[in-house]
Amino acid sequence: ETDEEPEEPGRRGSFVEMVDNLRGKSGQGYYVEMTVGSPPQTLNILVDTGSSNFAVGAAPHPFLHRYYQRQLSSTYRDLRKGVYVPYTQGKWEGELGTDLVSIPHGPNVTVRANIAAITESDKFFINGSNWEGILGLAYAEIARPDDSLEPFFDSLVKQTHVPNLFSLQLCGAGFPLNQSEVLASVGGSMIIGGIDHSLYTGSLWYTPIRREWYYEVIIVRVEINGQDLKMDCKEYNYDKSIVDSGTTNLRLPKKVFEAAVKSIKAASSTEKFPDGFWLGEQLVCWQAGTTPWNIFPVISLYLMGEVTNQSFRITILPQQYLRPVEDVATSQDDCYKFAISQSSTGTVMGAVIMEGFYVVFDRARKRIGFAVSACHVHDEFRTAAVEGPFVTLDMEDCGYNIPQTDESTLMT
């Protein structure tokens, strides 16, 4: 259902001071400027809806320009507790504490928040990414070391009058950016506490948050150029489907990935692409300005709606799932990587999806909204879309029930 009913004051409208407060690019994440401590230390922090810790570099590291120096903050409090976060690849570990935190281009408030001071890491910080920490915006259930560590956004809402909602507009450039261009470029907006009408077109459509851990949603149908993949919808959500700004690609469960690639290959068969392209290993290139977008299909994900037996669909273009990559060896061409990949942990709607849409994380009403982003990359023939309603039966059966184990996968 679209969201046109009246809202409480301050919930909607214009948030000029927060527009354009993100920088970065899909391949290395989007970051917001934050200040920590007294006097304030400025850091760039990755916006990650796929984790729940606020963690910042707090020791020298070859990939960090700067780091949080706790000894220089008069308001730092040590929690005398360590935290260790392993990933499938890599890890970070650090010491827990609290300090005063604010977002210069965010709400005009300062909150005392938990901070993990990262003292050691492996395969976490990215060379040239320009961020020094991570802001985990998901729920306490997946916080480390356990769910008693209050996430930043919970602290923000508790300590201020900021409504329990944020929204993200991630703007993919549509062309590769070099380091100086990234530093100068606008990457999008994180609107804390509300929705900015200028950032989207059309209507917002909402899907329920299935469970408050990750931002888990339910996909009920997948189409490639309007052709149904015709899989048992449980496969689309095996073992979960999440919205994750800290992941680059659209990641799909193995069976779904294989079916989707087969269908995309068939739709784009006028050109023969190497197997390595579909694996994300080989680039495909065309003479500058001649990328044949029209030969690639659109991809539609149908999401459970707010009303029984009702769904809506979000549709992305090849401009979202072919990621521009700069390579000096082929600099005369426009080159791309296939940004859909295989997952063993369920569907991850990463930057590839989010760059098409304005995404509202309405925690207060346990739902996620999608509208066409005012900054998405498209051509004169096709545009990303959010459309509905569609009648879909037995959508509850599409959810997969995970056997209970402690699980947290960040920045995969």
Epitope: P274, D275, G276, Q282, L283, V284
Partner: antibody
Framework: EVQLQQSGPELVKPGASVKLSCKAS?????NFWIHWLKQRPGQGLEW???????????KYNQKFKAKATLTVDTSSSTTYMHLSSLTSEDSAVYYC?????????WGQRTLVTVSA | DIQMTQSQKFMSKSVGDRVSVTCKAS??????VAWYQQKSGQSPKSLIY???HRYSGVPDRFTGSGSGTDFTLTISNVQSEDLADYFC?????????FGGGTRLEIK
């Protein structure tokens, strides 16, 4: 400037193992896969396998699956190839190469000599 | 595995000549073929990708052509520094495979 710096020549005994390295610079390391190749006189170039530095995913030529193991250390932008149970057949020049379209960049070569 | 066959092992040309090095794939590889030059004691150098596209910095006397199964690298106005082995490679499917090479000698 993109560079792939390979480790120096190795003289090893039959049955032993060796670990070759390839340090990358001049580009975003996690954006491109690294491949390893073998060249023996009169036998042309053979593709051994490849690794994705962003997540350590590997894919091997079936012929080298029991011989080579590829690993990566992103903190130093270095890829490694471990060759085990060496025989005289493994005496060769080994290259690392970076993906893109095909292999636009190659390392400078590492000579491995297996001799008692 | 896809076989890449370079039937001519050696070619001898004079400076200023035009030379065509051929390569045949055992099955259709589209345009997913690259060409490399390797001088004695050195690493291969990338010349051509996607059958006919020159990598940045490669002199325009090197041109590639072909698709499907038959591919050609042409060097027009051969120079003495072109003395080298030339290899084709298919990157259409795994495992990636190379031709056996063609040695260009300068008379």
């Amino acid at each position: 400037e993109v560079q792939l710096q390979q480790s120096g020549p190795e003289l090893v005994k039959p049955g032993a193992s060796v670990k070759l390295s390839c340090k990358a610079s001049g580009y975003t390391f996690t954006n491109f896969w690294i491949h390893w190749l073998k060249q023996r006189p009169g036998q042309g170039l053979e593709w051994i396998g490849m690794i994705d530095p962003s997540d350590s995913y590997t894919k091997y030529n079936q012929k080298f699956k029991a011989k080579a193991t590829l690993t990566v250390d992103t903190s130093s932008s270095t890829t490694y190839m471990h060759l085990s149970s060496l025989t005289s057949e493994d005496s060769a020049v080994y290259y690392c190469a970076r993906s893109g379209v095909a292999f636009p960049y190659w390392g400078q070569r590492t000579l491995v000599t297996v001799s008692a | 595995d896809i076989q890449m066959t370079q039937s001519q092992k050696f070619m001898s040309k004079s400076v200023g000549d035009r030379v065509s090095v051929t390569c045949k794939a055992s099955q259709n590889v589209g345009s997913n073929v690259a060409w490399y030059q390797q001088k004695s004691g050195q690493s291969p150098k990338s010349l051509i990708y996607s059958a006919s596209h020159r990598y940045s910095g490669v002199p325009d006397r090197f041109t590639g052509s072909g698709s499907g199964t038959d591919f050609t690298l042409t060097i027009s106005n051969v120079q003495s520094e072109d003395l080298a082995d030339y290899f084709c490679q298919q990157y259409n499917s795994y495992p990636y495979t190379f031709g056996g090479g063609t040695r260009l000698e300068i008379k």
